[in-house]
Interface confidence: low
């Protein structure tokens, strides 16, 4: 019968033949008696077989990740007989990886939204990488993820490829951020190939900053002619945060006369100081009224950063209007 | 090689102001955050600031809000520090330091500081 | 009053490993990277351990840094004669929402 061993060529052999192993029939004697043949898909191109000996060699370079097995069969035919001495079987012959293959990552680009101030070990986005070389042989496959930039902000987890934060940041004073992973394979032993991707990682806005009156006293005048319902003037806060989340309401916190009212222009996010009742400039010729802004929409667990509204004090002028 | 050069020593009386300067080199001027350090004389060192020189933003320490501005020119990349209304116990060495780009990034590269005296 | 809290001096002799202690507390140290700066006399501060236990290139191997809890420590072997300087640590403060220095520890190195 046929005396089979296991076949391997390593792919990417430089050498212009590599010596795959032996045909050998056990009714072989060795007095060359014997030919050897070689047929299927890659006899007599990639592979070659040395017909009085059954000795197998690869001729060309293979590339396992192109095709990583080649299905043959042998033949033994007695020469002087002309006969088959084994009957033709079929065998394998496989190709070994060597690490040729850097990680890659397919899902490219990578672009993430975590809103700011997460806590540490927030999960900010998962990148994979993938390997053309073969998972069961060795550590060729296998790999490890680091971050090359991004640092202290986020942190990667080496065998998911999991992003998390790792410190606190602030959209305030920076709203987006590159973060530079790399995934090595070999699990990171000498020899390892890499490859790198980039992930933006925005931070989404929350409502960590109220909103601060720009002036802390306001002048405003009205004349005593007016009616009730008059803007006599606007007041302006601040709020470094964005969208909703600097959205405010005016409201008067201390007006003992009660003669005005402020209400919020939601488009400007100013405040209108309006004439609640008539004044009479003989009766009172000014006032003196303070007005508090907080923001519109303040989320249970924010509500340590809004704890004490802003306020400003308006001082209000009465033009006193000649009466007939 | 990177560098933070400041302006050169002043002497103020109680109630003036003074503006310090800090010209950068050797480096990107909007990559970096740029912060104020003081120590009066004999004593420990105590942050002032920080200033974003790319967004303007800026955050100042509590003890110094009302009274510290600080502020950047991009054509010179120069960032400006300055201090109002001065008492003696402002009295110190001003350092500018570079930050990183998050504000808890320790300071990498330090200005040679600049002396400012406040007496009558 | 510092809100991180360091000796304030410390003495050795040439050869030998001192240690600089630096307490604070969650809102600090607790909660943030811990760095250590050394000033030389007459000189601004120069960055000697960030991020807890990391050197900048230039700076000896004989300079380590840690971080427990609420406390850091700068350790110091081989002690030189051009070790003597102040030495300072420093961290963010996330309820001062700025940073905060340790008032410093002199380091005097006994011939």
């Known amino acids: 019968g046929w005396v089979w061993n296991q076949f391997f060529v390593p792919e990417e052999m430089n050498t212009t033949s590599h010596h795959v192993g032996r045909l050998r029939s056990d009714l072989d004697n060795g007095n060359n008696s014997f030919q050897y043949k070689l047929l299927g898909a890659g006899a007599g191109s990639t592979f070659i077989i040395d017909e009085r000996t059954g000795d197998i060699y690869a001729i060309e370079k293979l590339d396992r990740e192109e095709r990583s097995l080649y299905i043959l069969r042998a033949q033994v035919i007695d020469i002087t007989t002309g006969r088959a001495v084994e009957p033709e079987s079929e065998f394998v012959i496989k190709v070994s990886d060597i690490n040729d293959n850097e990680p890659k990552f397919l899902d490219e680009p990578y672009e993430a939204i975590v809103p700011e101030m997460s806590p540490e070990g927030t999960l900010v986005i998962q990148v994979t990488a993938s390997d053309a070389d073969d998972p069961s042989s060795g550590n060729n496959a296998r790999l490890l993820y680091s971050l090359l930039q991004g640092q202290p902000y986020f942190s990667v987890e080496p065998t998911t490829g999991v992003i998390r934060i790792s410190s606190k940041m602030d959209r305030e004073l920076q709203d987006e951020y590159w973060v530079i992973i790399q995934a090595k394979d070999m699990i990171g032993q000498p020899g390892a190939l890499s490859g790198t991707t980039s992930v933006l990682i925005k931070l989404s806005d929350v409502n960590d900053n109220k909103p601060i009156f720009k002036e802390s006293l306001y002048r405003l005048t009205v004349s005593e002619s007016a009616p009730t319902g008059t803007s006599i003037g606007t007041i302006m806060a601040y709020d470094n945060d964005i969208g909703e989340n600097a959205e405010m309401d005016y409201s008067i916190e201390e007006d003992d006369s009660q003669t005005f009212d402020i209400i919020t222009n939601h488009e400007t996010q100013e405040g209108i100081v309006i004439l609640k009742k008539k004044v009479n400039f003989e009766h009172q010729n000014h006032y003196g009224i303070r007005a508090k802004v907080k923001n519109h929409h303040v989320d249970e667990q924010l509500m340590k950063y809004h704890t004490e509204a802003s306020t400003t004090f308006i001082k209000i002028q009465v033009e006193d209007v000649d009466e007939p | 090689q990177v560098q933070l050069v400041q302006s050169g020593a002043e002497v103020k009386k109680p109630g003036a102001s003074v503006k310090v300067s800090c010209k950068v080199s050797?480096?990107?001027?909007?990559?970096?955050?740029i912060h104020w350090v003081r120590q009066a004389p004999g004593q420990g060192l105590e942050w002032m600031g920080i200033?974003?020189?790319?967004?303007?933003?800026?955050s100042y320490a509590q003890k110094f809000q009302g009274r510290v501005t600080m502020t950047r020119d991009t054509s010179t990349s120069t960032v400006f520090m300055e201090l109002s209304s001065l008492r003696s116990e402002d009295t110190a060495v001003y350092y500018c330091?570079?930050?990183?780009?998050?504000?808890?990034?320790?300071?990498?590269?330090w200005g040679q500081g600049t002396l400012v005296t406040v007496s009558s | 009053q510092s809100a991180l809290t360091q000796p304030p001096s410390v003495t050795g002799t040439p050869g030998q490993r001192v240690t600089i202690s630096c307490s604070g507390s969650r809102s600090n140290i607790g909660s943030n990277f811990v760095n250590w700066y050394q000033q030389l006399p007459g000189t601004a501060p120069k960055v000697l351990i960030y991020?807890?236990?990391q050197r900048p290139s230039g700076v000896p191997d004989r300079f380590s840094g840690s971080k427990s809890g609420t406390s850091a420590s700068l350790a110091i072997s081989g002690l030189q004669s051009e070790d003597e300087a102040d030495y300072y640590c420093?961290?963010?403060?996330?309820?001062?929402?700025?940073?905060?220095f340790g008032g410093g520890t002199k380091l005097t190195v006994l011939s």
């Open positions: 991020t807890n236990n």
């Open positions: 420093a961290t963010w403060d996330d309820s001062m929402n700025g940073w905060v």
């Open positions: 050797g480096y990107t001027f909007t990559s970096y955050f």
């Open positions: 200033i974003n020189p790319i967004s303007v933003s800026t």
């Open positions: 330091a570079r930050g990183g780009i998050q504000l808890w990034l320790h300071l990498d590269y």
